[in-house]
Interface confidence: medium
């Protein structure tokens, strides 16, 4: 199961070679390789060259590259030949960049985080914008508050709960200091009466294949809202799950491949195999979304250099219903917020 998204294919049509232009041959057959493979600097991958012959140290960002001396695939690099017209023989290693996003006429690069206003933090992930609310006003404390109201406070970005029957508020529940949640002021002190808050995870940014999901949590030393992220893969793009729906049924809520496989991410491989569960599909107009899930930590080992771990959504169960107009509309969870229009325009 590849967690890695297919990199945006960077294609260009080379101009026809002029007859006077000779293109150098970088590969020789039969292969001629040194007796022992080279020792690569720390963090540089030892890979098979583009001729499928010898072990070489992968070219790094900004290095020259050829069909033989290829760029480090584990760092998401590709050989950009655009500067070597018309031969297209020697290129420069460049970063594979995902598709950017456009929101309200503003272009954002892949991976860029931005705040369209003081209430939301958004991230562009491969053509999709995912947003999480920064206004973390907790639910009104139901135990004592009989008439809660959500009001705008002059000079503050986020609405806050006020309780009209404040006089009846018992002493022991006076924990809430809304200053700890106000996203408008950059207050860096720790509040003793900080209430731990973690928002729900945002919907996965893609309906199939690798996506990203984010949430806000103030469970940190500063009691300050910070964004956490995890990888998510709701369903594979290359499997027709409808074929797996049992006879007489309209939906398959959960699809699980037969074989356990390793997750791969940027050329690195998970240290153990997994048999992930995916949300299924329906033959009617219902959609299937995660219902029971958890976040697991997946350890990756890279061919060369250090490994790393990533938080990954693990789907336990899904349900199929009519309410999700678009199974993973990145804005689906935001529609209940008063300023949704400010983002979605």
């Amino acid at each position: 199961t590849a967690l890695s998204p297919t990199p945006t294919t960077m294609t260009f049509t080379p101009a026809p070679l002029e007859e006077t232009t000779t293109r150098p041959e970088f590969c020789k057959w039969p292969c001629e390789c040194p007796q022992s493979p080279p020792r690569c600097p720390l963090g540089v991958s030892l890979i098979t060259d583009g001729c499928e012959c010898c072990k070489i140290c992968a070219q790094q960002l900004g290095d020259n590259c050829t069909e033989a001396a290829i760029c480090d695939p584990h760092r998401g690099l590709y050989c950009d030949y655009s500067g070597d017209r018309p031969r297209y023989a020697i290129g420069v290693c460049a970063q594979v960049v995902g598709v950017g996003c456009v929101l309200d006429g503003v272009r954002y690069t892949n991976g860029e985080s931005f705040q369209p206003n003081c209430r939301y933090n958004c991230t562009c992930i491969d053509g999709t914008v995912g947003c999480t609310p920064l206004c973390l006003s907790p639910r009104p404390p139901r135990l004592w508050c009989r008439q809660p109201r959500h009001v705008r406070v002059p000079g503050q970005c986020c609405e806050q709960w006020v309780c009209d029957d404040d006089a009846r508020r018992p002493r022991q529940t006076a924990l809430l200091d809304t200053r700890a949640f106000a996203a408008s002021g950059a207050v860096e002190q720790r509040y003793e009466n900080c209430i731990a808050y973690t928002s729900p995870w945002s919907p996965c940014s893609t309906t199939c294949g690798l996506g990203i999901s984010t949430r806000i949590s103030n469970v940190n030393a500063r009691c300050w809202p910070e964004q956490e992220s995890r990888l998510c893969n709701l369903r594979p793009c290359d499997v027709d799950i409808q074929l797996h729906i049992k006879a007489g049924k309209k939906c398959l809520a959960v699809y699980q491949p037969e074989e356990a496989t390793n997750f791969t991410l940027a050329g690195c491989v998970s240290t153990r195999t997994y048999r992930p569960k995916y949300c299924g599909v329906c033959t009617d107009n219902r959609c299937c979304i995660p219902y029971k899930s958890k976040t697991i930590s997946v350890d990756f080992q890279c061919p060369e250099g250090p490994g790393f771990s990533r938080q990954v959504l693990w789907i336990n169960a899904c349900f199929c219903n009519l309410s999700c107009r678009n199974p993973n509309d990145i804005f689906a969870d935001l529609e209940s917020y008063p300023d949704f229009e400010e983002i979605a325009n």
Epitope: K249, C251, L252, A253, V254, Q256, R275, K277, C288, Y291, K292, S293, K294, W314, N316, A317, C318, F319, C320
Partner: antibody, heavy 121, light 107 residues
């Protein structure tokens, strides 16, 4: 380590209802598929119902259909099993059991301590 | 419903003996079979899942095997603390049915 904590023993009259709770302290109920199993005195285990991930809904054994309701309150991480129209043969220990979810269908790797329900006039 | 037929219903063996309990499914359940141990007055505990996988923390003297629709729980060397009732369960198709149980005693 996941723990399931069930409510205390109940004594009910025939025709009444009983609601047994099962709390998951320090863990999220949304990560678990919850099931209920009962065991009459000196008898074997009997599956009553639980969450079926393949269909994406809670399903009940035919025997209990219409009499049992299983619900979950994710805000308190508590599962409930309510059995109505009680009769003497419903006297049993009621267990909540959970599966952790690595497979679509999973064995019950965590069990509550059991709640004794006695139905007697 | 899938019927799980477990045998024997009770057995008595000596400490150190090799003990086997069998379970037969009335139809194909693939490897979706679990074995549980229930000590008197306690809740059941998972021993084996997926037919032959040992649940973490369970002593290695317990093992499971499968052959078609026949499943076997083996205790390689019986210990006094193994006195309990043992149940098989299929969890492939709802309703998830249990075998009638095997009561194991020490001679």
């Amino acid at each position: 380590e996941v723990q399931l904590l069930e409510s205390g023993a109940e004594v009910k009259k025939p025709g009444a209802s009983v609601k047994v709770s099962c709390r998951v302290p320090g863990y999220s109920l949304s990560e678990l598929s919850m099931h209920w199993v009962r065991q009459a005195p000196g008898k074997g285990l009997e599956w009553m119902g639980g969450f079926d991930p393949e269909d994406g809904e809670t399903i009940y054994a035919q025997k209990f259909q219409g009499r049992v309701t299983m619900t979950e309150d994710t805000s308190t991480d508590t599962a409930y099993m309510e059995l109505s129209s009680l009769r003497s043969e419903d006297t049993a220990v009621y267990y909540c059991a959970a599966s952790g979810g690595w497979e679509v269908h999973d064995a019950f790797d965590t069990w509550g301590q059991g709640t004794m329900v006695t139905v007697s006039s | 419903d899938i019927v799980m037929t477990q045998s024997p219903s009770s057995l008595s063996a000596s400490v150190g003996d090799r003990v086997t309990i069998t379970c037969r499914a009335s139809q194909d359940i693939s490897y979706y079979l679990a074995w549980y141990q229930q000590k008197p007055g306690k809740a059941p505990e998972l021993l084996i899942y997926a037919g032959s996988s040992l649940q973490s923390g369970v002593p290695s003297r317990f093992s499971g095997s499968e052959s078609g629709t026949d499943f076997t729980l083996t205790i390689s060397s019986l210990q006094p603390e193994d006195v309990a009732s043992y149940y098989c369960q299929q969890y492939k198709t709802a309703p998830y049915t249990f075998g009638q149980g095997t009561k194991l005693e020490i001679k």
